[in-house]
């Protein structure tokens, strides 16, 4: 069944990074508009992006209510200009999205090195804690707040004068590494959720930061 001259949406795809979550679909509408519904397995259908001519819908405000829930969305197609018509007894065509569990599936955004500080032969590297749109008691939570110890960071570091990389890992946002005195080092970090077994277990690498630039501070003791 379907409504005259409307085409069901297809290629429904979740795009999610650090819990900012958008549902995308095709086709670009010609004489039709869309409405999205989202539900959890224990919840019910909630309509969003009413009668939109866009082919995306930001569902972040729904999924952040419980990022460990599994969500299902569907996109309804309506003929443009007739969306409020009650004359038709036909149900508008719709397509279901794949199921989406934010905690397991949101991509990890590119991390940023907040600072590094050298004290003698040790360097403390701090990763910036990203804020998310997930809330608890009206307070926005950081990525670390949400994932806790499930989230680790891998630090790649190397002497500016060579290409041999070393790695370190932490389940906080700080590294304390040993360096050679008098050498400049470069750093890059990557966010990782080791428990994930899918392609989204790692973020892209952060921008490289090197000693001798403004982010760092060096103190010889």
């Amino acid at each position: 069944s379907g409504t005259t001259n409307t085409v069901a949406a297809y290629n429904l795809t979740w795009k999610s990074t650090n819990f900012k979550t958008i549902l995308e679909w095709e086709p670009k509408p010609i004489n039709q508009v869309y409405t999205v519904q989202i539900s959890t397995k224990s919840g019910d259908w909630k309509s969003k992006c009413f009668y939109t001519a866009d082919t995306e819908c930001d569902l972040t405000d729904e999924i952040v209510k419980d990022v460990k829930q599994t969500y299902l969305a569907r996109v309804f197609s309506y003929p443009a200009g007739h969306v409020e018509s009650t004359g038709s007894t036909e149900e508008p065509p719709y397509e279901n999205s794949p199921e989406f569990t934010p905690y397991l599936e949101t991509n990890l955004g590119q991390p940023t090195i907040q600072s590094f500080e050298q004290v003698g032969t040790k360097v403390n590297v701090t990763v910036q804690d990203e804020w998310t749109l997930v809330r608890r008691n009206d307070t926005f939570l950081s990525l670390r707040d949400v994932f806790g110890k499930d989230l680790i960071y891998t630090l790649y570091y190397w002497k500016s004068s060579s290409s041999g990389k070393k790695t370190a890992k932490t389940n906080t946002n700080e590294f304390l590494i040993d360096v050679d005195k008098g050498e400049n080092y470069c750093f890059s970090v990557q966010a990782v959720i080791p428990s994930r077994r899918t392609a989204n277990r790692k973020s892209t690498d952060s921008p490289v930061e090197c000693m001798g630039h403004e982010k760092g501070e060096s103190r010889e003791i």
Epitope: S1, S39, K41, S42, G43, D44, W45, E91
Partner: antibody, heavy 118, light 107 residues
Framework: QVQLVQSGAEVKKPGASVKVSCKAS????????MHWVRQAPGQGLEWMGM????????SYAQKFQGRVTLTVDTSTSTAYMELSSLRSEDTAVYYC???????????WGQGTLVTVSS | DIQETQSPSSLSASVGDRVTITCRAS??????LNWYQQKPGKAPKLLIY???RLHSGVPSRFSGSVSGTDFTLTISSLQPEDFATYFC?????????FGQGTKVEIK
């Protein structure tokens, strides 16, 4: 265990309003939607609408749009259904029922008989 | 709105009988079809959800299935406590709608 306890029977005159309460216990109130279903004497079941207690989002059957108002008080885990402009055909047992998935009513209140009579 | 047509509207059966009730939806509803039992003066009780899943605490003599657009509730061996009215209900599309009911009476 999940319990939904509704307020007592009501007798109303045509044109009046009625407000039925439904006190929930045994689960986290804001996690599950609350629906309202009515049943006229000797008749079938009719879905009226639903509310998400986490944000008070509502959805109503078109037949009741503008006449029914669903609300919640999360501090007391209580849901309310108010029906206005009552007419004799609104005489029915009104049930609150907790959702357990899209359009799935796993737990029901005991029902509240609303009689509309002049 | 989607309409469910239940058949039969009533039936007489004996204890131990196999009973089948059918519900046909006017439009596609995927597997979002639920069955409820109601006894006089009581609230409905969920028996089967998502076409064939047994709700917790419901005896295994109740089962649900689908063939094409026909959804079926089967009671394999009718017990005295099963004499009641049974409703199907679609949970796929708003507004949610119920069948008109099937009354199972003692023969």
């Amino acid at each position: 265990q999940v319990q939904l306890v509704q307020s007592g029977a009501e007798v109303k005159k045509p044109g009046a309003s009625v407000k039925v309460s439904c006190k929930a216990s045994g689960y986290t109130f804001t996690t599950y939607w609350m629906h309202w279903v009515r049943q006229a004497p000797g008749q079938g079941l009719e879905w009226m609408g639903m509310i998400d207690p986490s944000d008070s989002y509502t959805s109503y059957a078109q037949k009741f749009q503008g006449r029914v108002t669903l609300t919640v008080d999360t501090s007391t885990s209580t849901a309310y259904m108010e029906l206005s402009s009552l007419r004799s055909e609104d005489t029915a047992v009104y049930y609150c029922t907790r959702g357990s998935g899209p359009g799935l009513f796993a737990y029901w209140g005991q029902g509240t008989l609303v009689t509309v009579s002049s | 709105d989607i309409q469910e047509t239940q058949s039969p509207s009533s039936l007489s059966a004996s204890v131990g009988d196999r009973v089948t009730i059918t519900c046909r939806a006017s439009q596609g509803i995927s597997n979002y079809l639920n069955w409820y039992q109601q006894k006089p003066g009581k609230a409905p009780k969920l028996l089967i959800y998502h076409t064939s899943r047994l709700h917790s605490g419901v005896p295994s003599r109740f089962s649900g299935s689908v063939s094409g657009t026909d959804f079926t509730l089967t009671i394999s061996s009718l017990q005295p406590e099963d004499f009641a009215t049974y409703f199907c209900q679609q949970g796929n599309t708003l507004p949610y709608t119920f069948g008109q009911g099937t009354k199972v009476e003692i023969k």
